[in-house]
Interface confidence: medium
């Protein structure tokens, strides 16, 4: 008799999820000498233990605690780059500017980036058919709780000047409902963080507007200022040139505004 399976609204667990997590862990520890001590099998066991046999709408931060301990890592707290709705450019930037870090440049962020996962209550099976959607099904699902946990703690670790890359092409440049807007902004520690500097990335080549005057940016400034953190904002009019100038800062064309 086929067993009844809960149908969720979101896509199922990424194909070859266990193999992918294990392979990423091995690759990360090979590239980062300071993480060579990490036992990737233990990391996978802790990851799996966070969601296997548990109802995928009833996951807690506590479920991920064993994984958090295994992923312990120092981050240069004054070199943190947050991002919202512009992940690819943020990652291209930290690939060039190697001393800056996004969450996905850490072991835990790297392991889970772009993956989906969930289990089923009372069975050891991974659900490859469907997983809960944050809006349509439930917010306490394995993927959402993972990112909320690591994002909160990443923001808590930040100090001095924290940068955030925002997508100037979106209707809401700053979105209160994004991970940045709902989690990271509220977990920056005012006694450690002096300034949040927003980089608003322009989409169109001919777009010369000052997007730092956008109402949603003003809303972000207000939230940050109320938390006793200074706020600054820069327009990045030409993201392609911006990256090129990060690679070659001595280029003569890099003295003009980008």
């Amino acid at each position: 008799v086929p067993r009844w399976r809960q149908q969720w609204s979101g896509p199922g667990t990424t194909k070859r999820f266990p193999e992918t997590v294990l392979a990423r862990c091995v690759k990360y520890t090979e590239i980062h000498p300071e993480m060579r001590h990490v036992d990737c099998q233990s990391v996978w066991d802790a990851f799996k233990g966070a969601f296997i046999s548990k109802h995928p709408c009833n996951i807690t931060e506590e479920d991920y605690q064993p994984l958090m301990k295994l992923g312990t890592q120092t981050v240069p707290c004054n070199k943190i780059l947050l991002w919202s709705r512009i992940k690819d450019l943020a990652h291209q930037f930290t690939q060039v500017q190697r001393d800056m870090f996004t969450l996905e440049d850490t072991l835990l962020g790297y392991l889970a980036d772009d993956l989906t996962w969930c289990g089923e209550f009372n069975t050891s099976k991974i659900n490859y058919q469907s997983c809960p959607d944050w809006r349509k099904d439930c917010s306490n699902n394995p993927v959402s709780v993972f990112w909320k946990t690591v994002s909160r703690r990443f923001a808590e670790a930040a100090c001095d000047v924290v940068h955030v890359m925002l997508n100037g092409s979106r209707s809401k440049i700053f979105d209160k409902n994004s991970t940045f807007g709902s989690v990271e902004v509220h977990n920056l520690q005012p006694e450690k963080v002096q300034t949040l500097e927003a980089w608003v990335i322009h989409g169109g080549r001919e777009d010369s507007r000052d997007l730092c005057q956008d109402p949603t940016i003003k809303e972000l400034e207000s939230i940050i200022s109320k938390r006793n953190i200074q706020f600054s904002c820069k327009n990045i009019y030409r993201p392609d040139k911006f990256l090129q100038c990060v690679k070659n800062p001595e280029d003569s064309s890099c003295t003009s505004e980008i």
């Epitope: 605690q65 958090m68 301990k69 992923g71 312990t72 890592q73 120092t74 981050v75 240069p76 707290c77 850490t106 835990l108 690591v150 909160r152 703690r153 990443f154 808590e156 670790a157 930040a158 100090c159 520690q189 006694e191 450690k192």
Partner: nanobody, 119 residues
Framework: EVQVLESGGGLVQPGGSLRLSCTAS????????MSWVRQAPGKGLKWVSA????????SYADSVKGRFTISRDNSKNTLYLQMNSLRVEDTAVYYC????????????RGQGTLVTVSS
């Protein structure tokens, strides 16, 4: 500016004891959970122990449970780690970190204090 200064490390024989201290400044110490982490020679960073802001809740890595005790004195802005029954494998640089429970991310503020357990 947030600053932490660890002290109390040294050379000790297996089975011996040490008490590490961490003096903090530049932030409201009593508002933050604090942790001890350590880095053995040639190895990565490992979480050791954490304590809540009030000191009412503590947690420990399995490898130190029953031997190490974390505590804090909020009136002195100081975090402590009492280390008993020390083993050779406890040899490491110990750092105190301003952080939420057991990590996973710690900032890189303290210089650390070296604990060497050797006969």
């Amino acid at each position: 500016e947030v600053q932490v200064l660890e002290s109390g490390g040294g050379l000790v024989q297996p089975g011996g004891s040490l008490r590490l201290s961490c003096t903090a400044s530049g932030f409201t110490f009593s508002s933050y959970a604090m942790s001890w982490v350590r880095q053995a020679p040639g190895k990565g960073l490992k979480w050791v122990s954490a304590i809540s802001s009030s000191g009412g809740s503590t947690s420990y890595a399995d490898s130190v449970k029953g031997r190490f005790t974390i505590s804090r004195d909020n009136s002195k802005n100081t975090l402590y780690l009492q280390m008993n029954s020390l083993r050779v494998e406890d040899t490491a640089v110990y750092y105190c970190a301003l952080g939420s429970g057991s990590g996973p991310f710690f900032d890189n503020r303290g210089q650390g204090t070296l604990v060497t357990v050797s006969s």
